[in-house]
């Protein structure tokens, strides 16, 4: 502060700055006029003994003689462009003359007016039946503000010992209502912004699965309380889980875009169809009203049951050597809509019964031809078979003469009926 | 004599530049604060801006925010208006105006007491 | 931004008629509006500053009024050459804003 400026006589101040009083925004001028012979100096702005560095001020010199050496008018004039609470103070004028420090006399800047909001209730959409919060908070000059809450334009009984509530505590409302807070002082009343509290309905709870089918769920759900609005349709999303899924679980948004059925409710329950066999989904669940929808449920986890596969074992070969009959084959290539649990075997021949063996899950088997009686078109079919059950079944396939050097057969050839020169096999 | 001469208006594409000069005489232009102030045809006034060429300091209003600039050389007692991405809803007669400052120490507000003749601006294909 | 409504927008009036403009704010201003005077093709020209002082060279047949949100400008005899749009302005707060504008016509 500048402790050594003079404002006894001598002083070449000859107007100093009046005084401002005024609400939040307003735009003043301070004016300040002095008279000096010579050169005129510059006119710097002080709030409360400080410099103002950036002063929005202008400056005139007006000469009142015909030479620079004459008198001079200096007129300074300092804009508050939009009073704000840092602005309010001790304004003064100073120009340093001949090595002196001149100041002028104060003027000064207040700043009183209506209640100024530092925080306005805001819009929110909220579950029915649930306790929300909406803040309000509001300023002087002049001191002090009271505050009046507002529900659909009636005013609230200000909560015992809390005349001036910044936090409005609700327990709940049934209906979209509409809040807005009023702040009082000595100048009058302002009215805050009206904020709109939508009710939404409360988040689904007990999300569940009815029944599993390969291809089918069946889930059923209870929903949450919807205030006056009855819920028109809840929407389900189904996801297909992946070794991912831990990471977006948390967050709101699965990483790609997930199956969304709508349904209308009552009865809450849905049938989800054309799913594939012993998979891993997430399901959530959210019921809308006219307000809008309520929350998501959190990621449900649920899988579907197992399928038969859906194709015979492919490649299917009978080769006799001797007295044994090698049979081969290969995995289905169609999906096997669960745990491949293993191969069935059967074969006949023309006039006896058919003969039925579990496998494993190895791909070929050595049967043993045994007897004397001879067996006509003797044939092998064979099916896979999960925890659902088999497959189909290949189709029949006749027994082929060993050829020498054949190798692995990797499908079988169409040939000649077999001799009938074998009996019953035996293993 | 106090005056403002206006000049630099015309015709100008969308999306264009126009520079427009405001001449003052008969008073220092670093003692006052300078307004353009523009009326589109047939409407009423509007307010585009104002500058203190005595510290440079410029203010605008939000419909030219970042598009017009508002600068002043008080050597040549002139201030400017640089205006930048031209619309068609810029067409308007823009007019400089001096600010009264002939209270005593203190104001609330203020007034336009000395005004050019006004140049026409027109932005059209 | 403040608003300031001006009425009537257009009036007709003789010579030697009082005519009085209102202008309303649409928050309060204090004394902080000025009134103009506009021709056509010409600029305006200040009448009233601070609500209600005289600008100076201005017929004393003008004069301001109000506070607050309410003014007034009145013409206590109307004269040929005051036939021209009048606005008000207010400069409590940036931005500064105009009325539309009140055009007085000969009747």
């Known amino acids: 502060a500048h402790k050594d400026t003079q404002t006894e006589a001598g002083s070449p101040f000859v107007g100093n700055p009046g005084n401002i009083t005024g609400a939040r925004g307003l735009t003043g001028t301070l004016r300040c006029e002095l008279q000096v012979q010579g050169e005129p100096p510059e006119v710097v702005w002080l709030r409360d003994g400080q410099i103002l560095e950036l002063a929005d001020n202008t400056q005139t010199q007006v000469p009142l003689g015909e030479d620079w050496q004459d008198e001079w008018k200096v007129v300074s004039q300092l804009r508050i462009s939009a009073l704000q609470l840092s602005d309010a103070g001790e304004y003064q004028c100073m120009v340093h003359l001949e090595g002196r420090t001149f100041v002028s006399q104060p003027g000064f800047v207040g700043l009183e007016g209506l209640p100024y909001f530092l925080e306005e209730p805001e819009d929110k959409a909220v579950p029915a039946n649930t306790p929300f919060n909406l803040s309000c908070q509001a300023q002087g000059p002049p001191e002090p503000v009271t505050l009046l809450w507002l529900q659909d334009a009636v005013p609230l009984a200000p909560v015992t010992g809390h005349s001036s509530q910044h936090s409005l505590q609700t327990p709940g409302l049934n209906k979209t209502s509409s809040f807005s807070c009023e702040a009082h002082n000595a100048k009058g009343v302002t009215t805050s912004r009206t904020a709109t509290i939508t009710v939404l309905p409360q988040r689904p709870h007990h999300l569940h699965v009815v029944s599993r089918q390969p291809t089918e769920l069946e889930v059923a759900w209870t929903p949450g309380l919807s205030g006056i609005y009855p819920l028109t349709h809840c929407n389900l999303q189904a996801v297909l889980s992946d070794d991912g899924v831990g990471i977006w679980l948390g967050k709101s948004d699965p990483p790609e875009d997930p199956l969304t059925l709508q349904v209308s409710v009552p009865p809450h329950q849905l049938r989800l169809e054309k799913l594939l066999p012993h998979t891993p989904y997430h399901i959530r669940i959210s019921c809308s009203s006219s307000q809008g929808p309520s929350p998501w449920t959190h990621w449900l986890p649920v899988e579907t049951t197992e399928g038969v596969p859906l194709g015979p074992p492919e490649n299917v070969s009978a080769m006799r050597n001797g007295s044994q009959v090698l049979v081969r084959w290969q995995e289905p290539r169609v999906p096997l809509q669960g745990t491949l649990l293993g191969y069935r075997l059967a074969y006949r021949g023309q006039d006896t019964p058919e003969v039925l063996m579990d496998i494993g899950l190895t791909r070929e088997v050595t049967l043993e031809l045994r007897g004397d009686r001879p067996v006509a078109n003797l044939t092998v079919s064979v099916t896979a078979y999960t925890s659902a059950g088999d497959g189909p079944w290949s189709l029949p396939v006749p027994l082929e003469p060993w050829r020498p050097g054949q190798g692995q057969p990797l499908h079988h050839l169409v040939s000649e009926p077999p001799p009938r020169a074998f009996s019953w096999p035996w293993w | 004599e106090v005056q403002l001469v206006e000049s630099g208006g015309g015709l100008v594409q969308p999306g264009g530049s126009l520079r427009l000069s405001c001449a003052a005489s008969?008073?220092?232009?670093?003692?006052?604060?300078i307004h353009w102030v523009r009326q589109a045809p047939g409407k009423g006034l509007e307010w585009v801006g104002w500058i203190n060429p005595y510290r440079g300091y410029a203010y605008y209003a939000d419909s030219v925010k970042g598009r017009f600039t508002i600068s002043a050389d008080t050597s040549k007692n002139t201030a400017y208006l640089q205006m930048n991405s031209l619309r068609a809803e810029d067409t308007a007669v823009y007019y400089c105006?001096?600010?009264?400052?002939?209270?005593?120490?203190?104001?609330?507000?203020?007034?336009?007491?000395?005004w050019g003749q006004g140049t026409l601006v027109t932005v059209s294909s | 931004d403040i608003q300031m409504t001006q009425s009537p927008s257009s009036l007709s009036a003789s010579v030697g008629d009082r005519v009085t403009i209102t202008c309303r704010a649409s928050?309060?201003?204090?004394?902080?509006v000025a009134w103009y005077q506009q021709k056509p093709g010409k600029a305006p020209k200040l009448l009233i500053y601070s609500a209600s002082f005289l600008y100076s060279g201005v017929p004393s047949r003008f004069s301001g009024s109000g506070s607050g949100t309410d003014f007034t400008l009145t013409i206590s005899s109307l004269q040929p050459e005051d036939f021209a749009t009048y606005y008000c302005?207010?400069?409590?707060?940036?931005?500064?804003?105009f009325g539309q504008g009140t055009k007085v016509e000969i009747k």
């Open positions: 008969g008073f220092s232009l670093s003692g006052s604060w």
């Open positions: 928050q309060d201003v204090s004394t902080a």
């Open positions: 105006a001096r600010e009264y400052s002939g209270w005593g120490g203190s104001s609330v507000g203020y007034a336009m007491d000395y």
């Open positions: 302005q207010q400069s409590y707060t940036t931005p500064p804003t």
